[in-house]
């Protein structure tokens, strides 16, 4: 039975040209996390972190995506095109798959607010 929940940074905004941390956290389960996938709004893979094989960043994003902190992902040199949904998929044993959603808005304004509060989607 899947007892866990994914907490995410929810809806966040960041400044064009800046960086932002995408973070998901699995709680309320003792399941072992075997792999975390990070996908972009068009469902293209940004990165995978496998517990036994480490991180693999998709080459097209290599210069703008950094692994971590933890199982999270840091997006750098943000453009307006980065606005949209991001998904974390946690493969766990024995529970199975958990999925979280984050919405990132990239703002032109220099007063872009980093509202990185944790919430359950």
């Amino acid at each position: 039975m899947m007892t866990g929940t994914i907490e995410t940074t929810g809806n966040i905004s960041a400044k064009k040209g800046g960086s932002v941390i995408l973070q998901c956290h699995l709680s309320s389960t003792m399941a072992q996390v075997t792999q975390v996938n990070w996908e972009q709004h068009d469902h293209s893979l940004l990165a995978i972190r496998n517990a036994e094989l480490g991180w693999h960043i998709y080459p097209a994003f290599k210069d703008r995506v950094a692994p971590g902190p933890g199982l999270g992902l840091t997006l750098q040199s943000l453009t307006m095109n980065d606005t949209g949904e991001y998904f974390c998929t946690y493969h766990t044993y024995p529970d199975g798959t958990y999925r979280g959603r984050i919405f990132l808005e990239v703002l032109e304004s220099s007063v872009a607010e980093h509202s990185a509060r944790f919430q359950i989607p």
Partner: antibody, heavy 117, light 107 residues
Framework: DVQLQESGPGMVKPSQSLSLTCTVT?????????WHWIRHFPGNKLEWMGF???????KYNPSLKSRISITHDTSKNHFFLKLNSVTSEDTATYYC??????????WGTGTTVTVSS | DIQMTQSPASLSASVGETVTITCRAS??????LAWYQQKQGKSPQLLVN???TLAEGVSSRFSGSGSGTQFSLKINSLQPEDFGSYYC?????????FGAGTKLELK
């Protein structure tokens, strides 16, 4: 077009070290992907040996961990396999390959290594 | 280690036929399975990744399916160039493991 080519001695004596080079053309090994070594035994079994990432970190097959080392020379766009204390059981065709999310989308042509005294 | 069991070990078929090769993982690998074709004296070539995504330049006569522990590769309307060996491989954990292979021969 990315191409990979293995090179090294075709014959190695038992207890010695096997050293192979993979030359990559058409793509920089520091620009992404992982760079793997795989071998194909005479009985047709394929065995993944390990990889070096674009940043230089390595992962090895636990069955070989005490004997294997994978390194790279980014200035020459080469990566290398060193396997210590070889026996006749290490006789195989050795391939280098490019890894995308740990499957292999480009392979070298392969080089046959025989371990014999 | 996640073991990959491929069947059949060998298969005889005629040009124009449709064949299916199966691969079973010893534990759940979700959709993290690749298929390769290898012709005599050549290096393996990627056909399918993530269980069903056809690699670039691969004929649409090939199709992959399955998830969890059961997977299959289907080849429609066999052509002379399709004969050779086929291997599955999981891309989910360390060590990455291949199946023992299926040799597809001309009947």
């Amino acid at each position: 077009d990315v191409q990979l080519q293995e090179s090294g001695p075709g014959m190695v004596k038992p207890s010695q070290s096997l050293s192979l080079t993979c030359t990559v053309t058409g793509y920089s090994i520091t620009s992404g992907y992982d760079w793997h070594w795989i071998r194909h035994f005479p009985g047709n079994k394929l065995e993944w040996m390990g990889f070096i990432s674009d940043s230089g970190s390595t992962k090895y097959n636990p069955s070989l961990k005490s004997r294997i080392s994978i390194t790279h020379d980014t200035s020459k766009n080469h990566f290398f396999l060193k396997l210590n204390s070889v026996t006749s059981e290490d006789t195989a065709t050795y391939y280098c390959a490019r890894g995308s999310y740990w499957y292999f989308d480009v392979w070298g042509t392969g080089t046959t290594v025989t371990v014999s005294s | 280690d996640i073991q990959m069991t491929q069947s059949p070990a060998s298969l005889s078929a005629s040009v124009g036929e449709t064949v299916t090769i199966t691969c079973r993982a010893s534990e759940n690998i979700y959709s993290y399975l690749a298929w390769y074709q290898q012709k005599q004296g050549k290096s393996p070539q990627l056909l399918v990744n993530n269980a069903k995504t056809l690699a670039e330049g691969v004929s649409s006569r090939f199709s992959g399916s399955g998830s969890g522990t059961q997977f299959s590769l289907k080849i429609n309307s066999l052509q002379p160039e399709d004969f050779g060996s086929y291997y599955c491989q999981h891309h989910y954990g360390n060590p990455l493991m291949f199946g023992a292979g299926t040799k597809l021969e001309l009947k």
